[in-house]
């Protein structure tokens, strides 16, 4: 009776279990009753990083110098190239597809540490009593205005993104 499931590193085709190609190799032809799976190594600047039945290898990532990228680790037949940014620049994501001088902290967050050549901007949420209503790469969270010191009262509470709104005290008649 033909199998309905195969072992690890195998795949089911034409009611038959065939071996997958190992990382670094692509599928040329499926196995038959009489022959093994035929695999071929990936070419230069290509890779496959899993046991597979792919008929085409993936192209290594290109670290585009026009985007500030350079090769951190050269790809092999089993691994993709890893890009990083030129010195002093920072990757915009884990995949490092583009570079920025530094990132800004969004409203509601303040700058805890300004970027350096080795570390990007470190942001922190504005705690109660502080706010930031701007996107900035250098501004800290600002304290809410103290209405009391201006002989005013709070008319609208502050948030992490907005200052308090002060207004005149109600005078007793």
């Amino acid at each position: 009776e033909p199998p309905t499931a195969c072992r690890e590193k195998q795949y089911l085709i034409n009611s038959q279990c065939c071996s997958l190609c190992q990382p670094g190799q692509k599928l040329v032809s499926d196995c038959t009753e009489f022959t093994e799976t035929e695999c071929l190594p990936c070419g230069e600047s290509e890779f496959l990083d899993t046991w597979n039945r792919e008929t085409h290898c993936h192209q290594h990532k290109y670290c585009d110098p026009n985007l500030g990228l350079r090769v951190q680790q050269k790809g092999t037949s089993e691994t993709d190239t890893i890009c990083t940014c030129e010195e002093g620049w920072h990757c915009t994501s884990e995949a490092c597809e583009s570079c920025v001088l530094h990132r800004s902290c969004s409203p509601g967050f303040g700058v805890k540490q300004i970027a350096t050549g080795v570390s990007d901007t470190i942001c922190e949420p504005c705690p109660v009593g502080f706010f930031s209503n701007v996107s900035s790469a250098f501004e800290k969270c600002h304290p809410w205005t103290s209405c009391e010191t201006k002989d005013l009262v709070v008319q609208q509470a502050g948030t992490n993104k907005t200052d308090v709104v002060c207004g005149p005290q109600d005078r007793l008649r």
Epitope: L67, S98, C99, V100, L101, V134, A137, F138, E139
Partner: nanobody, 116 residues
Framework: EVQLLESGGGLVQPGGSLRLSCAAS???????EMWWVRQAPGKGLERVS?????????YYADSVKGRFTISRDNSKNTLYLQMNSLRAEDTSVYHC?????????WGPGTLVTVSS
């Protein structure tokens, strides 16, 4: 298209002064925080100074505090850096930059050489 063009660099003796300008176009200048960044020959980038959109808040690297002053004229779409008491270690190419600070999204820079 965003364009930033720095000018005002040159050769100056230690202790001297220079005023750099950065002419901005292709974006609403008054809406953006702006930065001056410098790169000395064979060295990494140094973030020198920054100013908020309204020109009311500023940042200075410790290495330039008390000597450099950043300012802006939103009516002229221009950023400035007044540099006093210049030292040999201030020799660099100075660039202005705007958010989101994407690589290559800045001008060619202006070279400041401090030497006797």
């Amino acid at each position: 298209e965003v364009q930033l063009l720095e000018s005002g660099g040159g050769l100056v003796q230690p202790g001297g002064s220079l005023r750099l300008s950065c002419a901005a176009s292709g974006f609403t200048f008054r809406d953006y925080e702006m930065w001056w960044v410098r790169q000395a020959p064979g060295k990494g980038l140094e973030r020198v100074s920054a100013i908020n959109p309204q020109g009311t808040r500023t940042y200075y690297a410790d290495s330039v505090k008390g000597r450099f002053t950043i300012s802006r004229d939103n009516s002229k779409n221009t950023l400035y850096l007044q540099m006093n008491s210049l030292r040999a270690e201030d020799t660099s190419v100075y660039h202005c930059a705007k958010p989101p600070f994407i690589f290559g999204d800045w001008g060619p820079g202006t070279l400041v050489t401090v030497s006797s």
